[in-house]
C-alpha cells in the first residue's frame, strides 16, 4: 500500500504492497475458481469415463450452457468492452443454476464444489461493480431455474454424470475466455 506522507516507509511496511486493483482482484478470483474446477473435473474423470466419452452431444442437447460467440465482443477480433462485460456477467448468472446442480454431485470434493459456487457469486459482485453503468444485464427467472434444476436432477445416473462433466468443461471454457477478455479491459 502507499507510504503515508511524513512517515518513513519502513514504519509503514517493509516492503510495502499496493492494494489490488479491481482488475487484479477479478483476475485472482477467476484463477481461484478455475483451480476449483480442475479439482472437481479430476474427481469426475476418476469416477467415470465421461472425460473420454464421445457421446457428449447426446447430453449437450438437453443443456443450454452459456458460450462465448463472436457477437459477444469478447474475442480479439471485434472486441467491445461493454458488450463483453455484459456477456460475462449474464453468462455467470446463467451458470449459477448449473453450479447449484453440482452441489450434491461430489463426495471427496464437496467443499470445492461449494467454494466454486460461492466464489462465482463473489465474482459476479466484483464484475457488477466494474459494470455499474451497464443496464443491459438480465437475471434468469427463479422459476425457470427451479424447473431446470428439477429436470436435471431427474435424469438417470449416466446423464447426470455426463451433465456434471459438461457443466465443468463449459464453465472452464467460459471462464478462460472471460479471463482473456478481462485482461484487455
Amino acid at each position: 500500500a502507499p507510504v503515508l506522507p511524513g512517515e518513513d516507509s519502513k514504519d509503514v511496511a517493509a516492503p510495502h504492497s499496493q492494494p489490488l486493483t479491481s482488475s487484479e482482484r477479478i483476475d485472482k478470483h477467476i484463477r481461484y475458481i478455475l483451480d476449483g474446477i480442475s479439482a472437481l473435473r479430476k474427481e469426475t474423470c476418476n469416477r467415470s469415463n465421461m472425460c473420454e466419452s464421445s457421446k457428449e452431444a447426446l447430453a449437450e442437447n438437453n443443456l443450454n450452457l452459456p458460450k462465448m460467440a463472436e457477437k459477444d465482443g469478447c474475442f480479439q477480433s471485434g472486441f467491445n468492452e461493454d458488450t463483453c462485460l455484459v456477456k460475462i456477467i449474464t453468462g455467470l448468472l446463467e451458470f449459477e443454476v448449473y453450479l447449484e446442480y453440482l452441489q450434491n454431485r461430489f463426495e471427496s470434493s464437496e467443499e470445492q464444489a461449494r467454494a466454486v459456487q460461492m466464489s462465482t457469486k463473489v465474482l459476479i459482485q466484483f464484475l457488477q461493480k466494474k459494470a455499474k453503468n451497464l443496464d443491459a444485464i438480465t437475471t434468469p427467472e427463479p422459476t425457470t431455474n427451479a424447473s431446470l434444476l428439477t429436470k436435471l436432477q431427474a435424469q438417470n445416473q449416466w446423464l447426470q454424470d455426463m451433465t456434471t462433466h459438461l457443466i465443468l468443461r463449459s464453465f472452464k471454457e467460459f471462464l478462460q475466455s472471460s479471463l482473456r477478455a478481462l485482461r484487455q479491459m
Partner: antibody, heavy 115, light 107 residues
Framework: YPQLVESGGGLVQPGGSLRLSCEAS???????MSWVRQAPGKGLEWVGS????????YYNTKFIDRFTISRDNSKNTLYLQMNSLRAEDTAVYYC?????????WGQGTLVTVSS | AIYMHQEPSSLSASVGDRVTITCQAS??????LAWYQQKPGKAPKLLIY???DRYPEVPSRFSGSGSHEDYTLTISSLQPEDFATYYC?????????FGQGTKLEIK
C-alpha cells in the same frame, strides 16, 4: 474437509522457535495468503502476506526480524516460521486468503509461549 | 501505521434493535475497509468489503457505509445469531490494521 487447516501450534519456551503450517486446498495455489494472529481476549493483528509464487512477502514491521512466511505450492502449504518467541506472541494464528480483505480463513492454531 | 479507532468497545442490545458500530481511521482510506464478525472460538467471517459491499450470503440486515476516514457498520434489526464481536480492517496501507473490536452482547 475445510479449505484451510493450520497446524504446528503448541507450547514453546521463551526464546524458542516454531513453524506453523497451513494446508490449503488446490484452490489457493494462485492466491495471495496472509497470516493473522489474535492474542487471548484481544483483537486481530496482521502478521504478513505472501504472493502466489512466494517471490514477494510483506510483513508487519513488528515481526519482520523474527517471523518468516513461505509457501510450498507442490504441497499446497503455507508456512510461518517464528523465532525468538516471547510471551506476548501467545495467540491463535490464522491463515487466510488475502484479497486485501480476508475472505477465507482457517480455524486457527494456538501458540503458547511460556516457561 | 494506520490507527483504526473503533467505537463502542462493547454494546448491549436486544433482538430487533438497530445497531451502529463506527470505525475512524487516522488517515484517508478511499473506502478500502472491511468488516468482520467473530464468534468465540471461531475464525472471523467477512461481512462487508470496500466500505459498503456486502459479501455474498451475508444477510441484508448488515450494511456498511462511509468515506474518507469514517466508516459505519449497521445491523438494521438484530437477530439472536448476531451477538458476536465485530472488527473493521483497513487495507489501503500496509501493514493492514484492525479496529480493537466491538463486543455486541444481549441486553
Amino acid at each position: 474437509y475445510p479449505q484451510l487447516v493450520e497446524s504446528g501450534g503448541g507450547l514453546v519456551q521463551p526464546g524458542g522457535s516454531l513453524r506453523l503450517s497451513c494446508e490449503a486446498s488446490v484452490l489457493f495455489k494462485h492466491q495471495d495468503m496472509s497470516w493473522v494472529r489474535q492474542a487471548p481476549g484481544k483483537g486481530l493483528e496482521w502478521v504478513g502476506s505472501i504472493d502466489p509464487r512466494g517471490d514477494h512477502k510483506y510483513y508487519n514491521t513488528k515481526f519482520i526480524d523474527r517471523f518468516t512466511i513461505s509457501r510450498d505450492n507442490s504441497k499446497n502449504t503455507l508456512y510461518l516460521q517464528m523465532n525468538s518467541l516471547r510471551a506476548e506472541d501467545t495467540a491463535v494464528y490464522y491463515c487466510a486468503r488475502d484479497l486485501d480483505f480476508m475472505d477465507e480463513w482457517g480455524q486457527g492454531t494456538l501458540v503458547t509461549v511460556s516457561s | 501505521a494506520i490507527y483504526m479507532h473503533q467505537e463502542p468497545s462493547s454494546l448491549s442490545a436486544s433482538v430487533g434493535d438497530r445497531v451502529t458500530i463506527t470505525c475512524q481511521a487516522s488517515y484517508w482510506l478511499n473506502s478500502e475497509l472491511a468488516w468482520y464478525q467473530q464468534k468465540p472460538g471461531k475464525a472471523p467471517k467477512l461481512l462487508i468489503y470496500d466500505g459498503d459491499d456486502r459479501y455474498p450470503e451475508v444477510p441484508s440486515r448488515f450494511s456498511g457505509s462511509g468515506s474518507h476516514e469514517d466508516y459505519t457498520l449497521t445491523i438494521s434489526s438484530l437477530q439472536p445469531e448476531d451477538f458476536a464481536t465485530y472488527y473493521c480492517q483497513q487495507y489501503r496501507y500496509t501493514p493492514y490494521t484492525f479496529g480493537q473490536g466491538t463486543k455486541l452482547e444481549i441486553k
